[in-house]
């Protein structure tokens, strides 16, 4: 289907000429307390990442649902064979009904056993949950801090191994950068030490500390 919007509508519009503000406008900025340190990720980028993560999560859920449907279909096709009635008469169909009834009885027995197991497990889970609540009452729960999670960590948690390769590269770059800054700090520290030693400050410092 053709898109209704024209190409002209898609072109970026030229930016309007900057408006000259009065100096009084800027005084407010100077007097206001400084804004908090800006986040590395912009709000739009954060939103974009969140949308992306939700999309991925949705796809994963859909894929899982599809897998479950396929699994169910496969299970049914192995258990429920198609009825092949060509060439079979009343006698065989009677016998087939007996066979199928016997199979239904067997499946019913199995279902009863499974239901009994499930009921038992549910009871056990309920008991254990109660025990957990009882134990919780005896211990003071620590106050939980809100943890900021980086976009990388979020992607890692959601995508698992698939995101690892792309994330590893970034992590490696950060690591190198960090090592460089540490090296710089060490060098600065060493230079100060040398100056102190030369000016006899080291000895005086020790005296003062003692």
């Amino acid at each position: 289907m053709a898109d209704g919007s024209s190409d002209a509508a898609r072109e970026p519009r030229p930016a309007p000429a900057p408006i000259r503000r009065r100096s009084s406008n800027y005084r407010a900025y100077a007097t206001e307390p400084h804004a908090k340190k800006k986040s590395k990720i912009s709000a739009s980028r954060k939103l974009q990442l969140k949308t992306l993560l939700l999309q991925i999560a949705k796809q994963e859920l859909e894929r899982e649902a599809e897998e479950r449907r396929g699994e169910k279909g496969r299970a049914l096709s192995t258990r429920c064979q198609p009825l092949e009635l060509a060439g079979l008469g009343f006698a065989e169909l009677q016998d087939l009904c007996r066979q199928l009834h016997a199979r239904v009885d067997k499946v019913d027995e199995e279902r009863y056993d499974i239901e009994a197991k499930v009921t038992k497990n549910i009871t056990e889970i309920a008991d254990l949950t109660q025990k957990i609540f009882d134990l919780r009452g005896k211990f003071k729960r620590p106050t939980l801090r809100r943890v900021r999670i980086s976009a990388d960590a979020m992607m890692q948690a959601l995508l698992g191994a698939r995101a690892k390769e792309s994330l590893d590269l970034r992590a490696h770059l950060k690591q190198v950068k960090k090592e460089d800054t540490e090296k710089e700090n060490r060098e600065v520290g060493d230079w100060r030490k040398n100056i102190d030693a030369l000016s006899g400050m080291e000895g005086r410092k020790k005296k003062f500390e003692s």
Epitope: Q81, P82, E84, G87, L88, G89, F90, A91, E92
Partner: antibody, heavy 121, light 107 residues
Framework: EVQMVESGGGLLKPGGSLKLSCAAS????????MSWVRQTPEKRLEWVAT????????YYPDSVKGRFTISRDNAKNTLYLQMLSLRSEDTAMYYC??????????????WGQGSSVTVSS | DIQMTQTSSSLSASLGDRVTISCRAS??????LNWYQQKPDGTIKLLIY???RIHSGVSSRFSGSGSGTDYSLTISNLEQEDIATYFC????????TFDTGTKLELK
């Protein structure tokens, strides 16, 4: 022309095993149920086994249940009868027959020439 | 199991005769009865199915009738090629069962 040709018969000792084959031609094999019928030396006809068109269902009389297995290969248009723990009373001419039905009435409309099986010590 | 019995194991007739072969079931078989012909060379052919329906390629000289437990096969105007053994078979209940057969001979 509808045709069935049996093979694999022979002479063997009690307790032995044998596999009969039946090559079918002249019709769409996978559309029909098939049967094995035997004729004893006293000329009595006995139904031995039936298999559905796709091979999912099989039927046997109590006299052979657990010892005989009917199977089919629709790609090869071939019917089989695997016979285990053979007894002297299994001595017979084994016929392969095509099955059909009419309003629930089931019958063998075309028969092979037969394959002879003799079980003797 | 349903037992199938024929009134006579052999029957003598002359060419051109009208011959009737009877068959009885040990219980009701609701018209699920078939007739087969076995020639002396061992070849077996279906003649009649569902009591009275003639199989394709079979001469109209053959006819079938009956109901409940009693059934019969009739050959009108007997011919040389009809000399064979005739079997009835029930298709009502498994196991499918045949009678011992009636051998038709010339007088």
């Amino acid at each position: 022309e509808v045709q069935m040709v049996e093979s694999g018969g022979g002479l063997l000792k009690p307790g032995g095993s044998l596999k009969l084959s039946c090559a079918a031609s002249g019709f769409t094999y996978s559309n029909y149920a098939m049967s094995w019928v035997r004729q004893t030396p006293e000329k009595r006809l006995e139904w031995v086994a039936t298999i559905s068109s796709g091979g999912s269902y099989s039927y046997y009389p109590d006299s052979v249940k657990g010892r005989f297995t009917i199977s089919r290969d629709n790609a090869k248009n071939t019917l089989y009868l695997q016979m285990l723990s053979l007894r002297s009373e299994d001595t017979a001419m084994y016929y392969c027959a095509r099955r059909d039905n009419y309003y629930g009435s089931t019958f063998m409309d075309y028969w092979g020439q037969g394959s002879s099986v003799t079980v003797s010590s | 199991d349903i037992q199938m019995t024929q009134t006579s194991s052999s029957l003598s007739a002359s060419l051109g005769d009208r011959v009737t072969i009877s068959c009885r079931a040990s219980q009701e078989i609701t018209n699920y009865l078939n007739w087969y012909q076995q020639k002396p060379d061992g070849t077996i052919k279906l003649l009649i199915y569902y009591t009275s329906r003639i199989h394709s390629g079979v001469s109209s000289r053959f006819s079938g009738s009956g109901s409940g437990t009693d059934y019969s096969l009739t050959i009108s105007n007997l011919e040389q090629e009809d000399i064979a053994t005739y079997f009835c078979q029930q298709g009502n209940t498994l196991p499918l069962t045949f009678d011992t057969g009636t051998k038709l001979e010339l007088k």
